[in-house]
């Protein structure tokens, strides 16, 4: 006999990297039938929900009007269909970014370079932070963590076609808040396109995610939300 | 189609209670929020409270806790709404309300005629 | 608590001319509920979560705004407009509804 139920879905709209003091909403999806909804936050009862009509609803949302370092977290829900609870969703890391400083990102040799050449990126930031991350826009972009006091170095090695791109990264003064984006770098690799198999597998980010971050920050506008879940975990894991 | 029957007015008298009703139709009575709001004559709406009737789980307004309670009668898919210690700040029109949640795609709210309750000796 | 402020209280408009109510909170909310009420009836659902006609509302009405400021426009007043229009804002749970005081848009 069934003594759980399969587990919700959980994502954040428009995107689970919120800038400070904006506002975000926390999507938990379970089954139609489902009479109540929990969210919890860093393994907490954080909030809780009641679909109405039931039968007609399998989604529930949570309001955050005004993301801070508070609020920034591990969230995860649950469902209920009469006494019978479900299984705990995964993990939703939600960042708050916008905090404190912008670093800059710079690319070595240089921004236009020839497939097979060795390129190194370099995120700096001046304040107290360790942790950096690279992100790369595009399908089967790309997400890195650096380490370093002031600056950390992404070596890509060999680079092939397969990596041009828009870069950006950030510095993480906690696993769920980080600053400001540096300004975008765009590399541009000339060579041989049959080297894009080469390509390194690296955890992906969702496409054109950058272009969804800047339009969440000027225009609330909401995305397509169906990767997110899958990102963060890869993210910050 | 869905309706939410009340009768029209009640008379009471000052220091008393009375028991509004809110017959509903046309629907899973347990499937959607009962609220109750309240208009005295020229003003705005004030809302009292809310019950689930699936479990009769209520929230209300803290102005009207102690005031008002609400209840359910599944049998009969009615809503019921008891105001007590009546006074003239209690003449007014109560209208019960039938809403599913805030983000639902196809929001329904639907509304009662009213009750035009008068407290007078 | 939430506190809805709707500005103007009382407005008069022109048959043919634009008319915009405002309906300010007292801190972010997500969704702007309005509702439409004639004298000696009940008041009727007219624009959900912000910018969505209720069934048999009239396209020159729309409805705008996030955060703390919303609003709800007539693109071109009709005499049948004339009514009372309430901003509410519909709290999920525990479940709580909360009205603006109310703006009268009178014909002239």
């Known amino acids: 006999q069934q003594q759980t139920l399969p587990k919700p879905f959980i994502w954040a709209e428009p995107h689970f990297m919120v800038p400070k003091e904006k506002q975000v909403t926390i999507c938990c999806q379970g089954n139609y039938g489902a009479v109540e909804y929990q969210l919890h936050f860093e393994g907490s009862l954080f909030a809780v929900d009641r679909p109405k009509p039931p039968e007609r609803i399998n989604k529930v949302q949570f309001y955050i009007p005004d993301m801070n370092s508070r609020m920034a977290g591990q969230y995860s829900c649950i469902y209920r269909v009469g006494e019978l609870w479900s299984e705990p969703s995964n993990l939703l890391d939600l960042v708050v970014t916008e905090m404190y400083d912008t670093p800059t990102l710079s690319v070595h040799p240089g921004p236009e370079v020839i497939s097979g050449e060795k390129v190194t990126f370099y995120c700096r930031l001046d304040t107290a932070t360790s942790m950096f991350l690279l992100l790369k826009e595009g399908r089967s972009s790309h997400v890195q963590r650096g380490y370093g006091k002031v600056q950390a170095e992404f070596p890509l090695g060999p680079v092939t076609t397969a990596h041009r791109g828009t870069y950006r990264c950030f510095g993480s003064y906690n696993n769920h808040a980080w600053s400001f984006p540096s300004e975008p770098v765009k590399l541009l690799v000339t060579g041989d396109i049959e080297n894009t198999s080469l390509a390194p597998e690296d955890p992906t980010f969702p496409a054109d995610t950058w272009g969804t971050y800047l339009l969440t920050t000027e225009t609330g506008l909401q995305k397509d939300h169906a990767l997110w879940d899958h990102t963060a975990q890869n993210l910050l894991r | 189609q869905v309706q939410l029957q009340q009768p029209g007015a009640e008379l009471v008298r000052p220091g008393t209670s009375v028991k509004l009703s809110c017959k509903a139709s046309?629907?899973?009575?347990?499937?959607?929020?009962m609220h109750w709001v309240k208009q005295r004559p020229g003003q705005g709406l004030e809302w009292i409270g809310v019950?689930?009737?699936?479990?009769?789980?209520?929230n209300y307004n803290q102005k009207f806790k102690g005031k008002a309670t609400l209840t359910v009668d599944t049998s009969s898919s009615t809503a019921y709404m008891q105001l007590s210690s009546l006074t003239s700040e209690d003449s007014a029109v109560y209208y019960c309300?039938?809403?599913?949640?805030?983000?639902?795609?196809?929001?329904?709210?639907?509304w009662g005629q009213g009750t035009l309750v008068t407290v007078s000796a | 608590q939430i506190v809805l402020t709707q500005s103007p209280a009382i407005m008069s408009a022109s048959p043919g001319e634009k008319v915009t109510i405002s309906c300010s909170a007292s801190?972010?909310?997500?969704?702007m509920f309005w509702y439409q009420q004639k004298p000696g009836s009940s008041p009727k659902p007219w624009i959900y979560?912000?910018?969505n006609l209720a069934s048999g509302v009239p396209a020159r009405f729309s409805g705008s705004g996030s955060g703390t400021s919303y609003s709800l426009t007539i693109s071109s007043m009709e005499a049948e407009d004339a009514a009372t229009y309430y901003c509410?804002?519909?709290?999920?749970?525990?479940?709580?509804?909360?009205f603006g005081g109310g703006t009268k848009l009178e014909i002239k």
């Open positions: 309300a039938r809403s599913s949640s805030a983000y639902y795609s196809n929001y329904e709210a639907y």
């Open positions: 046309g629907y899973t009575f347990t499937s959607y929020w």
């Open positions: 019950i689930d009737p699936s479990d009769s789980y209520t």
């Open positions: 801190s972010s909310v997500g969704y």
């Open positions: 979560r912000t910018s």
């Open positions: 509410q804002q519909y709290h999920s749970y525990p479940p709580m509804w909360t």
